[in-house]
């Protein structure tokens, strides 16, 4: 019997009856065995078929068989009720081999031309199964040339049998106080050949309670106890189960904080499995009673291990543990049934004694020394010398523990010095310098630093002076010795101030005229304002109306007197403002260079002379009374004049302060 080609030779070819396309002879028997590679099958179809027709193809036939199974017995030219001819049919081997047998009997009634067939090996698609047959793979089947392989969904692993998907269902640990666990895929059928281990592990002190819920369906056996699939529950005390069948097991109170649940399945069956809802219990803690002015949250019927509650105080009350304030309070129930922290108190918020107000005082409104929530205090500034800046001074103790103003400010109000107060009555004579009396010029500042000069106090930590008076000290501000609060130049009873910084107007050029002869000294500490130390006011926009020609200004200082010595006592002189053109003209003749008097200057003095400021007065203020506010303001700064002070036809020249208000305000606000 001729053999077909053997793998690995190419598996395809042609078969034909002996003598084809001629008629075949009698008593012929021919057999072909075709073999394909593993995972392949053989496909065969006929291009010509002409055999003697006989009942059940008993005479002449072609028989196709694969292994022990006969695929077809063929004869005739066309199929009848009892005989089959191939027609256009394609035949497939069941495995990788196909046997073809041709036989003719001893006679033919007429000549028959036989058959011609073609074959080829083709891949078997193992993944396609006939309806009703078990699938090739549990989950995913992947066909390839010569074979197939199975794979599993996430959470499963391929069993050793290469077809079944076992669930990866071990190592799950449940640590919450309650929860649910179930067989894989529940309520769909659970997987085969799986071994699942679940752990419930709670903190010591808890006891786990298991409830089987919804449905229970685990493969069972009528005689033997759970031989196929089973569920077991293990604690450190005892084992429960095995469980199988269709009846929900009863509640299990484990009296243990750790439980291991084991579920094992075999290779067969189609059951939905189980679902467990677990809870836990523990020894309850005493019911928490909220302190007065506080409340407990959350409110529960009982509190067991790990349960917690917080205490929240009413507005205006704060948590206190003993004497210590707490930001928050939470207590946790312990395994022995006690709370881990003692109950705090809700104590009324105490803002504490209010801060002292510099140059002011505080008064308790609610009651003497009452500083608790909603208490009211009233700040006020020291009368006469200080006034409160944009604040009514009323503060309330708020829930956050801070004294808070009606505008919501937590910072102290500011007591600003009152400016321009003087004990001096106006209308003094303008003839002759006079001795100042206490409180007449409380803004007067004596500046020592190489030479004697003067200045005027602004606010409580600035001194306004002439640039030329402090130019040498601009880089060594601390060398300036600043004295105030005294009338006597040589008295030890002065208030000492020291300079932190000197600001000379950027437009001032030393030894090149006196334009922009203005400077500010910042003091390193605020001075205390009193009747002898009071700042001068800066001119208002409307101040020009009090500084017209012939209006009287007052200059004060310890400068040279007619006797040619520095004055021991503070002196002052009332002098009228001189017409600007008249003053300009007075200083246009030699030895004065043209343009000595600028628009940034004002002149004051008598045409007849005799009344003037002099060396040592430099930097001091030429002041005017604002009759609307009844406050004194600085209109000029003693700057320069004729070589001989008080000379007739010459005038004292002063820096015009109103031209420098923006400069002054900028420096003071920036520093």
């Amino acid at each position: 019997t001729p053999l077909g080609p053997k793998w690995p030779e190419p598996v395809f070819g042609r078969l034909a009856s002996p003598g084809f396309p001629g008629e075949y002879a009698n008593d012929q028997e021919r057999r072909w065995t075709l073999t394909a590679p593993p995972g392949y099958r053989l496909r065969l179809y006929f291009t010509h078929f002409d055999l003697e027709l006989s009942h059940l193809c008993e005479y002449d036939f072609v028989k196709l068989s694969s292994g022990a199974k006969v695929l077809a017995t063929l004869c005739g030219q066309e199929s009848t009720d009892t005989e089959r001819a191939p027609g256009k049919d394609t035949f497939y081997s069941l495995g990788s081999s196909l046997d073809i047998t041709f036989r003719s009997d001893y006679s033919n009634e007429k000549p028959f031309t036989g058959f011609e067939a073609f074959y080829a090996a083709e891949d078997i698609d193992e993944c396609q199964v006939a309806p009703g047959e078990a699938p090739t793979c549990d989950h995913h089947c992947h066909n390839h040339l010569g074979g197939f392989y199975c794979s599993c969904r996430a959470g499963y692993v391929l069993h050793r049998n290469k077809r079944t998907c076992s669930a990866l269902c071990s190592g799950q640990v449940f640590t919450q106080r309650s929860g649910e666990l179930s067989s894989p895929e529940y309520p769909r059928p659970y997987p085969k050949l799986s071994s699942c281990t679940y752990s419930i592990s709670l903190e010591e002190g808890f006891s786990v309670i298991l409830d089987f819920v919804e449905s229970f369906d685990v493969e069972t056996h009528p005689e033997t106890l759970c031989p196929y699939d089973f569920l077991k529950i293990q604690t450190d005390r005892e084992e429960h189960g095995p469980f199988c069948g269709k009846t929900l097991p009863h509640r299990i109170e484990t009296k243990s904080n750790t439980v291991t649940i084991t579920f094992v399945t075999d290779e067969s069956g189609d059951h939905t499995g189980w679902k467990i809802h677990y809870t836990s219990t523990a020894q309850p803690c005493p019911y928490p009673m909220a302190p007065p002015n506080g409340h407990v949250s959350p409110v529960q019927a009982k509190y067991i291990l790990k349960d917690s509650f917080s205490i929240f105080c009413e507005t205006g009350y704060e948590l206190l543990q003993g004497h210590l304030p707490l930001k928050s309070f939470t207590a946790v129930c312990q395994k022995d049934g006690s709370w881990d922290r003692p109950m705090p108190a809700c104590s009324i918020v105490d803002c504490g004694p209010p801060d002292d107000l510099p140059s002011g005082r505080v008064e308790y409104i609610t009651g003497p020394g009452v500083t608790t929530y909603k208490a009211v205090i009233q700040y006020s500034c020291e009368e006469t010398f200080y006034t409160m800046k944009v604040n009514d001074g009323k503060y309330v103790c708020e829930a956050d523990g801070f004294w808070t103003s009606s505008k919501g400010e937590k910072s102290l109000p500011v007591c600003e010095p009152v400016c321009g107060l003087s004990a001096r009555t106006t209308g003094g004579r303008i003839y002759g310098g006079q001795k100042a009396k206490p409180g007449d010029f409380p803004w007067q500042v004596l500046i020592l630093g190489g030479t004697t000069a003067a200045g005027a106090l602004l606010y409580d930590n600035w001194v306004l002076t002439a640039a030329h008076a402090v130019y040498e000290q601009k880089h060594d501000a601390s060398a300036l010795d600043i004295r105030m609060g005294t009338l006597k130049r040589l008295s030890p009873h002065y208030t000492q101030a020291w300079s932190e910084a000197v600001f000379i107007h950027e437009g001032y050029t030393h030894d090149a005229g006196f334009d922009n002869d203005i400077a500010l000294i910042k003091l390193n500490n605020k001075v205390v304002i009193n009747s002898n130390i009071t700042p001068i006011c800066l001119p208002r926009k409307e101040a020009e109306s009090f500084m017209r020609t012939d209006d009287i200004g007052t200059a004060s200082g310890w400068g040279l007197t007619q006797r040619g010595f520095l004055a021991r006592n503070l002196m002052y002189v009332d002098i009228p403002i001189v017409d600007h053109q008249k003053c300009t003209a007075a200083y246009e003749k030699p030895p004065y260079p043209r343009g000595s008097v600028t628009a940034n200057m004002l002149c004051a003095g008598l045409e007849s002379g005799g009344k003037d400021s002099c060396r040592g007065d430099s930097g001091g203020a030429l002041v005017f009374l604002d009759s609307e506010t009844e406050r004194w303001f600085v209109g000029g700064i003693v700057s320069w004049g004729s070589m001989n002070c008080g000379e007739a036809g010459q005038y004292g020249v002063y820096t015009k302060v109103i031209n420098y208000i923006p400069w002054i305000e900028n420096i003071i606000s920036d520093f």
Partner: antibody, heavy 121, light 106 residues
């Protein structure tokens, strides 16, 4: 040269008063403040107060306000300190000292010879 | 008021030896003044404005310091320097003195 002359000692009865003198020479008396100080072995040096001889302006520390009174006699260039209601606590050496006028004005460039006051019955 | 604490309370030095004594203030002072007082005599100004030597004072005396810490130094001790030394301030009212440092000759 500049000198401040004080009597050497004064013995006084408790409850009485005493006037201590300090005669200045060698400088213009009215140009310098005059200060008075008390020295006892345990308490050390204490400042009492001062006076401006040009116009008799005075200053006292709180402790001595009711105890001491400072005065001036310009014609003799003499400064005086009157101590009243004397007790044993007032027994001490009392110095007059001239205040500096060159720098801070707050120290003593010349000291008197000192008067030892003993209060005893 | 500002309290001035002098240290040491008592010290001794040999002729030619360098001597330093300190004066510590309870608050910052701008200037310190030093006086020398010998037994039976009145105090005498040594140093003014922290570091300036008073008229007639030997150059072996010097003063230094700032804020709350000041010192008086004698570069080479001489027999005539045996005395009690006082520091004084008037940066803050009232004027106060230290309790003194007694310097003895070894």
């Amino acid at each position: 040269q500049v000198q401040l002359q004080q009597p050497g000692a004064e013995l006084v009865r408790p409850g009485s008063s005493v006037r201590l003198s300090c005669k200045a020479s060698g400088y213009t008396f009215t140009n310098y403040w005059m200060h008075w100080l008390k020295q006892r072995p345990i308490q050390g040096l204490e400042w009492i107060g001062d006076i401006d001889p040009s116009d008799s302006e005075t200053h006292y520390i709180e402790k001595f306000k009711d105890k001491a009174t400072l005065t001036i006699d310009k014609s003799s260039s003499t400064a005086y300190m009157h101590l009243s209601s004397l007790t044993s606590e007032d027994s001490a050496i009392y110095y007059c000292a001239r205040g500096d006028i060159t720098t801070t004005l707050r120290y003593f460039d010349v000291w008197g010879t000192g008067t030892t006051v003993t209060v005893s019955s | 008021q500002i309290v001035l604490t002098q240290s040491p309370v008592i010290m001794s030095a040999s002729p030619g030896e360098k001597v330093t004594m300190t004066c510590s203030a309870s608050s910052s002072v701008r200037y310190m003044y030093w006086y020398q007082q010998k037994p039976g005599s009145s105090p005498r100004l040594l140093i003014y404005d922290t570091s300036n030597l008073a008229s007639g004072v030997p150059v072996r005396f010097s003063g230094s310091g700032s804020g709350t810490s000041n010192s008086l130094t004698i570069s080479r001790m001489e027999a005539e320097d045996a005395a009690t030394y006082y520091c004084q301030q008037w940066s803050s009212y009232p004027l106060t003195f230290g309790a003194g440092t007694k310097l003895e000759l070894k």
